[in-house]
Interface confidence: medium
């Protein structure tokens, strides 16, 4: 669709067309399965245009359907690791909050291999945070082309 | 600057025991993955064990596994290695080194290491 | 594991040569995940390269690493007398982390 005059001047913000692409911070304490990201131009590649961070999770700002992104690899593993090392490996991200939206949006497992991705489209509304949880015992790479986590706002 | 100290190094019987320390200083130790590496006397480098910043994640080496126990005090910035039943084959320098950064498995710095000799 | 084979054992040369030392994986290493270190006799080993080809900090720039896959290259420019050590490969891109078994620089 064509944009008014006035729409043009407007931040890509106001229009609803919020984004965000992270990379990897850190992951949790014992017990804790969530990665933890950061963004923004002071780290490169990374940015968030809308959404925001909340205590290294990603909620979201604005209600519509979302392009939903992620890539992980593996820092420390190898085509036997992943099976002989404890435990599978698995990636789930899902709304953690609020609890009554909760839900599982993704999961992955990396059998055997050392990288996974995947993306969807997913409704999501105004104040879901988005969590990302890395099961098993298996290190993410924080290195920025191998392990990143994004959305993108396609329409109400 | 950052500093890695080991020490509890000594001889033991074979079928003994030894409990390595590296003490850490000069980086937010809780940030950083670490490891322990150990070189026989004129050998090869070997890696021993890894384990994560908060301690949750470990690794070992399939000659030391089930015999070998990687832990660390994140309050005291120290890093551990409980060795039992050791073997003669266990002699070496065991140098513990920092990872990069919390995930990343190079190690950008090391301590000076201290000689494990088991012997009867 | 991922065997890695140094060669040759021992380089002679003079301070001003070219060095070139070798490392050959028995598999891929993913992601150039490959790291040199210098050694020094009675002391711990020092990081140089990391990810095949970055400089470590406070590396001086005649030291390059290059390769991927299973053959990767240590380059010193123009040896320095403080260069003769032992140099090590090292893989991390699988467990378990395996070092190569050294290439000795020594004084000619």
């Known amino acids: 669709q064509r944009l008014s005059r006035a729409q043009q001047q407007l931040p890509l913000e106001s229009l609803g067309w919020d984004i965000a692409e992270l990379q990897l911070n850190h992951t949790g304490p014992q017990q804790d399965p969530r990665l933890y990201w950061q963004g923004g131009p002071a780290l490169g590649r990374s940015f968030l245009r809308g959404p925001e961070l909340d205590k290294g999770q990603l909620r979201i700002r604005r209600d519509g359907i979302y392009m939903v992104h992620i890539q992980v690899t593996l820092a420390i593993c190898s085509s036997t690791s992943t099976s002989r090392h404890h435990h599978p490996t698995t990636l789930a991200v899902g709304i953690c909050s609020p609890a009554s939206r909760s839900i599982s949006l993704l999961r992955l497992s990396f059998h055997q291999g050392c990288t996974i991705a995947s993306q969807r489209l997913t409704p999501l509304a105004r104040g879901d945070t988005l969590c990302t949880n890395l099961t098993g015992t298996l290190l993410p790479s924080r290195n920025t082309d191998e392990t990143f986590f994004g959305v993108q706002w396609v329409r109400p | 600057e950052v500093q890695l100290l080991e020490s509890g190094g000594g001889m033991v019987q074979p079928g003994g025991s030894l409990r390595l320390s590296c003490a850490a200083s000069?980086?937010?130790?809780?940030?950083?993955?670490m490891s322990w590496v150990r070189q026989a006397p004129g050998k090869c480098l070997e890696w021993v064990s890894a384990i994560s910043g908060s301690g949750g994640r470990t690794f070992y080496a399939e000659s030391v596994e089930g015999r070998f126990t990687i832990s660390r005090d994140n309050s005291k910035n120290t890093l551990y290695l409980q060795m039992n039943s050791l073997r003669a084959e266990d002699t070496a320098v065991y140098y513990c080194?920092?990872?990069?950064?919390?995930?990343?498995?190079?190690?950008?710095?090391w301590g000076q290491g201290t000689l494990v000799t088991v012997s009867s | 594991e991922i065997v890695l084979t140094q060669s040759p054992g021992t380089l002679s040369l003079s301070p001003g040569e070219r060095a070139t030392l070798s490392c050959r994986a028995s598999q891929s290493i993913r992601s150039s995940y490959l790291a040199w270190y210098q050694q020094k006799p009675g002391q711990a080993p020092r990081l140089l390269i990391y990810?095949?080809?970055s400089r470590a900090t406070g590396i001086p720039d005649r030291f390059s690493g290059s390769g991927s896959g299973t053959d990767f290259t240590l380059t010193i420019s123009r040896l320095e007398p403080e260069d003769f050590a032992v140099y090590y490969c090292q893989q991390y891109g699988d467990l378990p982390f395996t070092f190569g078994c050294g290439t000795k620089l020594e004084i000619k």
């Open positions: 000069g980086f937010t130790f809780s940030s950083y993955a």
């Open positions: 990810g095949a080809s």
């Open positions: 080194a920092k990872h990069d950064y919390s995930n990343y498995p190079y190690f950008d710095y």
